[in-house]
């Protein structure tokens, strides 16, 4: 079954290569377990950046790996991607699945364009 997911259109990564945005989905309804997947679209290629399942009742950090961190609160998920470089610029799509209990719902946002600008190297000092 279909479900709406919303995310910002554009986000600028920090000079340290960190970008954060909120992915909000229609409603968790009776869902106890929700799976959130971050996808990166480059041309016709779609690759999974990170994914995790969290329990709605927790409202805690649910994702903590080298690439992504995530916290949840109700039907909002705050996603942070780390270690971005200029070549990481692209469209990042938030996919939300209401996994359990049934019925299964899935929603995909329209994507957030993340712009990454590599910092200028410091000039040599004499």
């Amino acid at each position: 079954k279909g479900m709406h997911a919303a995310q910002p259109a554009v986000v600028l990564a920090s000079s340290r290569g960190v970008a954060s945005f909120v992915c909000e989905y229609g409603s968790s309804g009776n869902a106890a377990e929700v799976r959130v997947t971050m996808l990166r679209q480059a041309g016709s290629q779609m690759t999974e950046v990170c994914a995790a399942t969290y329990t709605v009742e927790d409202e805690l950090a649910f994702l903590d790996d080298s690439t992504c961190t995530g916290t949840s609160s109700g039907n909002k998920v705050n996603l942070t991607i780390q270690g971005l470089r200029a070549m990481g610029t692209g469209l990042y799509i938030c996919k939300v699945e209401l996994m359990y209990p049934p019925p299964y719902y899935v929603g995909m946002g329209n994507g957030t364009q993340i712009y990454v600008i590599d910092p200028e190297p410091c000039p040599d000092s004499d």
Epitope: S28, N30, A32, E33, T55, E57
Partner: antibody, heavy 116, light 112 residues
Framework: EVQLVESGGDLVKPGGSLRLSCVAS????????MNWVRQAPGKGLQWVAW????????TYADDFKGRFTISRDNAKNTLYLQMNSLRAEDTAVYYC?????????WGQGTTLTVSS | DIVMTQTPLSLSVSPGEPASISCRSS???????????LEWFQQKPGQSPQRLIY???NRFSGVPDRFSGSGSGTDFTLRISRVEADDAGVYYC?????????FGGGTKLEIK
């Protein structure tokens, strides 16, 4: 504090009908699915039905399809079980129970007796 | 429908001794997301059931660590490492993976 309070249990003649109620309090009713579970005297637990309180979508155990109807009134935070064509073997304590991974709650039960 | 078969029907255990209850499902109860929603309940006379274990092996808050759950696929076990007088009651397994959800028939634990 979460509370589930069942009511409506009674003595009913075979073939009769009855509606049980379960009033929920202390939490957002539409965030959790709700079950009816019954227990005949001296017997085990039997899952009857479940409703997604957000969508209203019901699911039944095969034994109860057609005779029993689970429903809810979100404005009243109340779960219902409408029982028709009652039989002696429907005599039981009926529990409402909140479906949850971490925080399940059960009511104290209400007793239905079907006898002539 | 998935049938949950519990054994034994009853057991009598002395305080301090271990107890083990088996629950077998008629087919796999692994849900489509990879989780297994197998739960254990305890019911004391005249009371509503109380959940002890969820998702096979996770103890519900406040449940003593004497209680443990294990298993996978179709075979599951509830163990009590050292039985206490307060543990007397009927124990039920429950599968919430595949609708219609179903309970096992129950195992009565009596303390000698």
């Amino acid at each position: 504090e979460v509370q589930l309070v069942e009511s409506g249990g009674d003595l009913v003649k075979p073939g009769g009908s009855l509606r049980l109620s379960c009033v929920a309090s202390g939490y957002t009713f539409t965030n959790y699915g709700m079950n009816w579970v019954r227990q005949a005297p001296g017997k085990g637990l039997q899952w009857v039905a479940w409703i997604n309180t957000y969508t209203g979508e019901p699911t039944y155990a095969d034994d109860f399809k057609g005779r029993f109807t689970i429903s809810r009134d979100n404005a009243k935070n109340t779960l219902y079980l409408q029982m028709n064509s009652l039989r002696a073997e429907d005599t039981a304590v009926y529990y409402c129970a909140r479906r949850s991974i971490y925080y399940p709650y059960w009511g104290q039960g209400t007793t239905l007796t079907v006898s002539s | 429908d998935i049938v949950m078969t519990q054994t034994p029907l009853s057991l009598s255990v002395s305080p301090g001794e271990p107890a083990s209850i088996s629950c077998r499902s008629s087919q796999s109860i692994v849900y489509s997301n990879g989780n297994t929603y197998l739960e254990w309940f305890q019911q004391k006379p005249g009371q509503s059931p109380q959940r002890l274990i969820y998702k096979v092996s996770n103890r519900f808050s406040g449940v003593p660590d004497r209680f443990s759950g294990s298993g996978s696929g179709t075979d599951f076990t509830l163990r009590i490492s050292r039985v206490e007088a307060d543990d007397a009651g009927v124990y039920y397994c429950f599968q919430g993976s595949h609708v219609p959800w179903t309970f096992g028939g129950g195992t009565k634990l009596e303390i000698k």
